[in-house]
Interface confidence: medium
Amino acid sequence: AITEAREEAKPYPLFPGPLPGSLQTDHTSLLSLPHTSGYQPALMFSPTQPGRPYTGNVAIPRVTSAGSKLLPPLAFKHTVGHIILSEHKDVKFNCSISVPNIYQDTTISWWKDGKELLGAHHAITQFYPDDEVTAIIASFSITSVQRSDNGSYICKMKINNEEIVSDPIYIEVQGLPHFTKQPESMNVTRNTAFNLTCQAVGPPEPVNIFWVQNSSRVNEQPEKSPSVLTVPGLTEMAVFSCEAHNDKGLTVSKGVQINIKAIPSPPTEVSIHNSTAHSILISWVPGFDGYSPFRNCSVQVKEVDPLSNGSVMIFNTSASPHMYQIKQLQALANYSIGVSCMNEIGWSAVSPWILASTTEGAPSVAPLNVTVFLNESRDNVDIRWMKPLTKRQAGELVGYRISHVWQSAGISKELLEEVGQNNSRAQISVQVHNATCTVRIAAVTKGGVGPFSDPVKIFIPAHGWVDHAPSSTPAPGNADPVLII
């Protein structure tokens, strides 16, 4: 931190020069300076490196003899109005004013383009006291000027709540051209015109532009910035850049690659993630997009079966995510799968084909000729059926599932039984008397449970009633049979 050296014998505090690592600023506490008449010119420095221009609160002594005089209007003296210099040079400028000693508490600040300058510059304020006035010179220096230092600088002095403003000092930092717009990489259609833009500024102006294609100049005569280059069309990739020239020299833009759009490369690494009886989930890695975004993809599916007609099923899908669930496939079948994707130019070749299989499915038909009758002596219900005619794709029969629902006044409960594939009959215990029992049967394979047969109902009387007449599966279109015993 910069510390103030306060000694009674010294009328002005003295700040040392730049202190390494000392980057703190003080923007509110103003320094009050004791001042003795007749003290010859002394220097007062602001903290340099951290620095806001010093806006010291200078206590200028009252001179009683001046109290009755008519004071002239206060104004900063005219100074240089325009400074032109090259980037990275140092610059120093000042404003000066003579303030009658009758005034107390003057403050000076520097402003740039309408905003108070808070720091980063070296500002020195010098005081030259005389009998009646104190000449104040506020110097301002910038080391290694940058383009952003361009602008209008003014001094402001606050005195007795009045603000006095100096004439502006315009700083113009000149350097090599500075790009405000450079050409951008593009992907273009073959033999189609496109534009590239290049813009650079000084000062100094003017800035002239030359275009370069694959290291050769395109235009013989320079164009004033900004420049638009119209390229009638390309058949192969090219690299463009622009050169910006002014009186200070030359700046070259980045080189940008102009690519020619083409059809995409085929997808790779088609993978199987999951297979069911009727669907296969696949994913793929997209190929190179040919400098044009993918629009959509096509999944092509062929059944691998000597008896099939070799037709190809095509499923269109979005290009992202790179995944698709192929549906409506046959159970227990082999398929060959390929993927192709398209961009605005066209379709890619098909990916390498991969083989995939669906698993066995559930039966598609229910058991036939279901009959149900009551064996009262054993207090059970006999159920009989015929094995369904299942397709090969449904897989091997592993058994049957029997659903029996018991309904009597106010109650209804369903029970499920599983029996083996060799059975074509089953017996179930009577659960409730004076009730209706509804029976349905489904065939089961490893692929799942098939459809249930149409329901067959039988009435279970109270104990003592005897009847062995069966209930059976109705003929199509008939109402559910109910056998009352």
């Epitope: 923007h27 951290p50 309408g114 808070l118």
Partner: antibody, heavy 123, light 106 residues
Framework: EVQLVESGGGLVQPGGSLRLSCAAS????????MNWVRQAPGKGLEWVSY????????FYADSVKGRFTISRDNAKNSLYLQMNSLRDEDTAVYYC????????????????WGQGTLVTVSS | AIQLTQSPSSLSASVGDRVTITCRSS??????LAWYQQKPGKAPKLLIY???SLESGVPSRFSGSGSGTDFTLTISSLQPEDFATYYC????????FGQGTRLEIK
């Protein structure tokens, strides 16, 4: 997409120290001045500190001067605030904020802010 | 330091209303003023800079005006997502913020 992500906040006792970080992405960090702004619970916003793109100009608010140090590492796209001698009144959410332009000696408005990190100073 | 005073401190309004918030500076600040919107638990978002310039991506129902010491933020037709706290900030000197205006649903 411009992103600023603060970290390093937490609970600290009065007199303790903490170092906040701000990771920047989605813009050329080395071309922008950066600031720390804080907000005490249920209160308004208070500017804390400023650092220019090249680190050669730094400003602090009076309330933190001599206790806080701002720094940056342009190679790591990171802004830091070292907070020493912490006081109860430093309890706040600390935001890092990007300055809209780089003009030496001028602080402008803040066009992008991080989500903030909470610093709690309590015994 | 330059002080900014916002009024009102809080405000109740309905969707579709036209709302105006004012910010007064203790000294002239030309047009070096910005407006921010802040929602609970979120960072402030820049709405307006240079007193009247609309930040990119901000809906056109937000507008700013004023110069010198008196500034206003106007929301022409309040939307549900506009209920938040609004702050002004001067940047002619060391940055300072207004105390905030809380905009609530009536």
């Amino acid at each position: 997409e411009v992103q600023l992500v603060e970290s390093g906040g937490g609970l600290v006792q009065p007199g303790g120290s903490l170092r906040l970080s701000c990771a920047a992405s989605g813009f050329t960090f080395s071309s922008y001045s950066m600031n720390w702004v804080r907000q005490a619970p249920g209160k308004g916003l208070e500017w804390v500190s400023y650092i220019i793109s090249g680190s050669d100009t730094i400003f602090y608010a009076d309330s933190v001067k001599g206790r806080f140090t701002i720094s940056r590492d342009n190679a790591k796209n990171s802004l830091y605030l070292q907070m020493n001698s912490l006081r109860d009144e430093d309890t706040a959410v600390y935001y890092c904020a990007r300055d809209e332009t780089v003009v030496r000696g001028v602080i402008n408005y803040f066009d992008y802010w991080g989500q903030g990190t909470l610093v709690t100073v309590s015994s | 330091a330059i002080q900014l005073t916002q009024s009102p401190s809080s405000l109740s309004a309905s969707v579709g209303d036209r709302v105006t918030i004012t910010c007064r500076s203790s000294q002239g600040i030309s047009s070096a003023l910005a407006w921010y919107q802040q929602k609970p638990g979120k960072a402030p978002k820049l709405l307006i800079y240079d007193a009247s310039s609309l930040e990119s991506g901000v809906p056109s129902r937000f507008s700013g005006s004023g110069s010198g010491t008196d500034f206003t933020l106007t929301i022409s037709s309040l939307q549900p997502e506009d209920f938040a706290t609004y702050y002004c900030q001067q940047f002619i000197s060391y940055p300072t913020f207004g105390q905030g205006t809380r905009l609530e649903i009536k």
